[in-house]
């Protein structure tokens, strides 16, 4: 806390400029008017204040706006934003996408900080849903943003926003998140033709059910192995050898390299060895000829 002292003669700040970097902390406290600072916040970003001096400037704004800063000030905080705590940010009401962009720019190139996470949370809650423009902005700054949301939070993403999602935005999503996103993507891209549809839906297929994979196998999509390996195991298991062959097209040869990994390993265990042999890949571990396969889960459901 800076002591209250009178401003020395001739040192009262008339504007926010570089002369202030030569002021000691107590002089900044005494000689800079908080209202002046608030109206000229945009100048701070160009001036190299020390961390200690920034603490004083923040303190002055906190005194002027104890209930939280107005958006006109927030939009021009610049690198003073880095001094804000999540508690400070929770007092804000940020409604403008321009304000959000300005503050995300300050943190650009860094991991998502607790301050940024709080800011985004406040902004999205204020909007009521994650609209396309917001999602566009957030994923541009933080490609992993979408995958940091819980399935519950993802449920507020409208299908129209899915158009903003790039494949790399989904890299760290787990199956639970893709389960929520896939139906939205399916809805968003439903009017596209076969090959274009597959290009768009491909990144979301980790949430696809068996029936959709079966449908895709009829469309000559030539799914690559990387995509296949991300499919839900429970969705892959019911697929026949013929369906997998059609689904992968020329990429089917890649199954051999992945035969010890899920979902390929578990899928092999469910296929007749005879059928696997038709692929000519030397895949082993299928059900030997002459054995009867009982689906116990189906039997339990019937009894």
């Amino acid at each position: 806390e800076v002591e209250k002292t009178a401003c020395p003669s001739g040192k009262k700040a008339r504007e926010i400029d570089e002369s202030l970097i030569f002021y000691k902390k107590w002089e900044l406290e005494a000689c800079v008017d908080a209202a002046l600072l608030a109206t000229q916040m945009d100048r701070v970003n160009a001036i190299p204040f020390t961390y200690e001096q920034l603490d004083v400037l923040k303190h002055k704004l906190d005194e002027l706006y104890p209930q939280g800063y107005p958006e006109s000030v927030i939009q021009h905080l610049g690198y003073l934003f880095l001094k804000m705590s999540p508690e400070d940010i929770r007092k804000w009401n940020v409604t403008s996408l321009e304000t959000l962009k300005a503050l995300l720019e300050v943190n650009k190139g860094h991991e998502m900080s607790p301050q940024v996470a709080t800011l985004i949370d406040r902004f999205v809650k204020g909007r009521g849903q994650l609209d396309k423009d917001t999602l566009d902005t957030l994923t541009a700054f933080y490609p992993g943003y979408l995958c940091s949301l819980s399935p519950e939070e993802l449920s507020s993403v409208p299908p129209s926003s899915i158009w903003a999602v790039r494949p790399q935005d989904l890299d760290t999503c787990d199956p639970r998140q893709l389960d929520v996103l896939y139906p939205k993507a399916r809805l968003a891209f439903q009017n596209m033709n076969g090959s274009e549809y597959f290009v768009k839906i491909q990144s979301f297929l980790g949430g696809a059910p068996t029936e959709d994979l079966k449908a895709l196998s009829q469309q000559n999509v030539s799914m690559d192995l990387a995509t296949f390996m991300k499919l839900r195991t429970d969705a892959v298991l019911p697929l026949t050898v013929a369906e997998v062959q059609k689904l992968l097209g020329p990429h089917v040869e890649g199954l051999k390299a992945e035969e010890r990994h899920r979902p390929v390993r578990d899928w092999i265990l469910r296929q007749r060895q005879d059928d696997l042999d038709t692929l000519g890949l030397g895949l082993q571990g299928g059900i030997p000829n002459g054995y009867l396969v009982l689906d116990l889960s189906m039997q339990e459901a019937l009894s």
Partner: nanobody, 112 residues
């Protein structure tokens, strides 16, 4: 992002001179104020001299007036600090700054 790299520090005798350089890369500087700061052990960082890249305005701290000169070379994107008549109390790590961006610092030691 803006990168700042200082050089030119070293050991010099009282009354001697040094010229510090700061090469700036990554972004144009028109909108920034650039400055030299220093920090002696156990003391707060303090501004030594500043230059407004767009207006050319120069400001010096009272304790270096008449001894230090700040200048720039636009074509080389470089900031300089010419330090003459150095004193033992000028011993510190000297930092170059542009807006929110800071260099790593260069050590200046004035001792006989």
């Amino acid at each position: 992002q803006v990168q700042l790299v200082e050089s030119g520090g070293g050991l010099v005798q009282p009354g001697g001179s040094l010229r510090l350089s700061c090469v700036v890369s990554g972004r144009t500087l028109e909108s920034y104020v650039m400055a030299w700061f220093r920090q002696a052990p156990g003391k707060e960082r303090e501004a030594v001299a500043s230059i407004n890249w767009s207006s050319g305005r120069l400001i010096y701290a009272d304790f270096v007036k008449g001894r230090f000169t700040i200048s720039r070379d636009n074509s080389k994107n470089t900031l300089y600090l010419q330090m003459n008549s150095l004193r033992p109390e000028d011993t510190a790590v000297y930092y170059c700054a542009a807006g929110r961006y800071w260099g790593q610092g260069t050590q200046v030691t004035v001792s006989s």
